[in-house]
């Protein structure tokens, strides 16, 4: 006996169309673009029913339901706006992602996504994953291009990348992105296998103030070329934080140097170092201090550290020097790991050119200079660690 004549569901069509369907005859259902085969909530890629000997179809008719891409993924540090209509998530609906203004910028695409027939929110470039809100780097409240031994007091927002690292001795670091800290290898070497012991503080101005944002380390990455207690070559390290920090006017990452950055770091160009290290009084600073110091000719610096008690070859090509020939302005113990920053005149953003590493026994000594890890030499290393971990 023939099976009941099948009626295609709305927004679907049936094939093949026959005058009647008898034993072993079958039909398939195909949905219009933007509609999908469903049995209730369960999706089907294809549907075919077979006429059985008792005159019934072996399965019920599915529906062709409009594709629903569902609520779009949340965007950390951003928001999503429904363009087509409130909460509309069906085929051809449009949404617009945007990042929190001032402190975040959108990476990857323009943030416009459409609900496509395959059920995925898709950007104009064909990406299915949501965009990324990346922290804006190098913003500072400072208006001048002005260190710590012989320095001045910093004001809120002047050095929002400044990180205070406790857990061993007092050290410093600089925030990169929203979950990495750039610092000196020697400053955290003792904690390299005990990352969780590092007490990391952001957004602080006063060293002992309770007003700061607490962060904890997930992992420590010491440059493989660094040898502890055998000079300071490759004195660079990264700390991965176990959570992303919220970016604001007091907590903002420093930029990494662009390829063209060396044009802003020539001899006599001014860099700024900041920290809570020893001041002229011989005590750790209570308030975050900063000092503006010029870059020193590399040969001049090398020569300054070839005399005893320093050994020849102390200053390598992976280092840069800064300070006054007359002395009086320098970074000092407790500043280690902090950033020596420069203003990129083209982007008007601050970038890290050096990391406070080592210097003369007596900070601010005439004819001696502060020695900093030359960050531009380590951009591939930094990017490799950050992208892989």
């Amino acid at each position: 006996q023939p099976c009941p004549y099948p009626m295609a569901p709305p927004n679907g069509h049936l094939s093949p169309v026959q005058a009647k369907y008898i034993l072993k005859d079958s039909f398939s259902i195909f949905c219009e673009p933007g509609y999908e085969l469903l049995q209730g909530h369960l999706p089907l890629k294809s549907f075919a029913a077979v006429c059985q000997k008792d005159g019934s179809w072996d399965q019920p008719m599915p529906s062709c339901s409009i594709v629903d891409c569902g609520p779009p993924d949340d965007l950390p540090s951003g928001r999503v706006e429904y363009i087509t209509g409130p909460e509309v998530t069906t085929y051809k609906a449009v949404i617009q992602y945007s990042c929190e203004e001032t402190f975040y910028t959108m990476k990857v695409n323009d943030g416009k996504y459409v609900c496509e027939a395959d059920g995925f929110w898709t950007s104009s470039k064909g990406e299915r994953s949501p965009p990324v809100c990346e922290p804006v780097c190098g913003l500072s409240a400072r208006t001048t291009g002005g260190r710590i031994y012989g320095g001045q007091k910093a004001k809120p927002g002047d050095f929002p990348w400044q990180v205070l690292i406790l857990g061993g001795s007092t050290a410093a670091g600089a925030l990169l992105y929203d979950n990495w800290v750039l610092t000196a290898a020697h400053a955290i070497y003792e904690q390299k296998h005990d990352a969780s012991s590092l007490d990391i503080r952001l957004g602080a101005l006063k060293r002992l103030s309770p007003h700061y944002t607490q962060a904890w380390a997930e992992a420590v990455f010491i440059h493989e070329g660094y040898t502890h207690d055998a000079g300071f070559d490759n004195d660079i390290a990264l700390i991965k934080l176990n959570n992303k920090v919220v970016i604001n006017s007091n907590i903002t990452p420093i930029c990494l140097p662009r390829k063209e950055a060396e044009s802003f770091m020539r001899t006599d160009d001014i860099g700024t170092a900041s920290g809570w290290g020893l001041t002229q009084r011989g005590l750790l600073a209570r308030n975050l201090m900063y000092v503006d110091i010029p870059i020193v000719d590399h040969q001049k610096c090398t020569a300054a550290y070839e005399k005893p008690p320093y050994s020849g070859g102390s200053v390598t090509a992976n280092m840069l020097c800064a300070g006054l020939e007359s002395g009086g302005k320098d970074s000092c113990r407790g500043d280690a790991g902090g950033a020596l920053v420069f203003l990129d005149n083209e982007t008007q953003r601050w970038f890290v050119g050096g990391i406070v590493s080592w210097g003369s026994m007596n900070c601010g000594e005439a004819g001696q200079y502060g020695v900093y890890t030359k960050v531009i030499n380590y951009i591939p290393w930094i990017k490799n660690i950050i992208s892989n971990f």
């Epitope: 209730g40 909530h41 399965q59």
Partner: antibody, heavy 115, light 107 residues
Framework: EVQLQESGPGLVKPSQTLSLTCTVS?????????WNWIRQPPGKGLEWIGY???????SYNPSLKSRVTISRDTSKNQFSLKLSSVTAADTAVYYC????????WGQGTTVTVSS | DIQMTQSPSSLSASVGDRVTITCKAS??????VAWYQQKPGKVPKALIY???YRYSGVPSRFSGSGSGTDFTLTISSLQPEDVATYYC?????????FGQGTKLEIK
């Protein structure tokens, strides 16, 4: 014949992430249907966790959505479950299954959440 | 969420009896209901889908009916091997939900 087999650790510590994999043989997970995870606490009934469809789209139980991720590896014909921040209440037998026109279940794997 | 309420929660019947288990949905689920049988320590086995369609290999004594909110699983002549817990399940909407189960024993 279609076969599903769950694998993963039988013991997970509280607050950690439970990770299970379902290996499918005899049918490609991209060919059709929804590939589900279902669990059954000791002595209790069945609870649907979510599915990943043939196209890679996911649907999750709203009561677990904030903690659940279902993904797939089409090259290995596998789909996986990750359940974060587990507690003792997540102790159960976990099944992978394809439901509706095809109906096949894995044998189930017992996961205990305990320190 | 759609609640699926089964009754009775347990029942005892004799071999050869006609057994009926009912399932009530808290809202309309069309015919998107399946029935499962689970024997102690075993994996659930599907019996019925789309309220009344029997899976291949399932004995003809099992049948299902209903639509909307009221559904029934019938065993026309109870056999000793039918001792199990039976679950209804709706797959009409997210989340898929199961009834609490009906435990069937032989008198």
């Amino acid at each position: 014949e279609v076969q599903l087999q769950e694998s993963g650790p039988g013991l997970v510590k509280p607050s950690q992430t439970l990770s299970l994999t379902c290996t499918v043989s005899g049918y490609s997970i991209t060919s059709d249907y929804a590939w589900n995870w279902i669990r059954q606490p000791p002595g209790k009934g069945l609870e649907w966790i979510g599915y990943i469809s043939y196209s890679g789209r996911t649907s999750y139980n709203p009561s677990l959505k904030s903690r659940v991720t279902i993904s797939r590896d089409t090259s290995k014909n596998q789909f996986s479950l990750k359940l974060s921040s587990v507690t003792a209440a997540d102790t159960a037998v976990y099944y992978c299954a394809v439901l509706y026109a095809l109906d096949y279940w894995g044998q189930g794997t017992t996961v205990t959440v305990s320190s | 969420d759609i609640q699926m309420t089964q009754s009775p929660s347990s029942l005892s019947a004799s071999v050869g009896d006609r057994v009926t288990i009912t399932c009530k949905a808290s809202q309309n689920v069309d015919t998107n209901v399946a029935w499962y049988q689970q024997k102690p320590g075993k994996v659930p086995k599907a019996l019925i889908y789309s309220a009344s369609y029997r899976y291949s290999g399932v004995p003809s004594r099992f049948s299902g009916s209903g639509s909307g909110t009221d559904f029934t699983l019938t065993i026309s002549s109870l056999q000793p091997e039918d001792v199990a817990t039976y679950y209804c399940q709706q797959y009409n909407s997210n989340p898929l939900t199961f009834g609490q189960g009906t435990k069937l024993e032989i008198k």
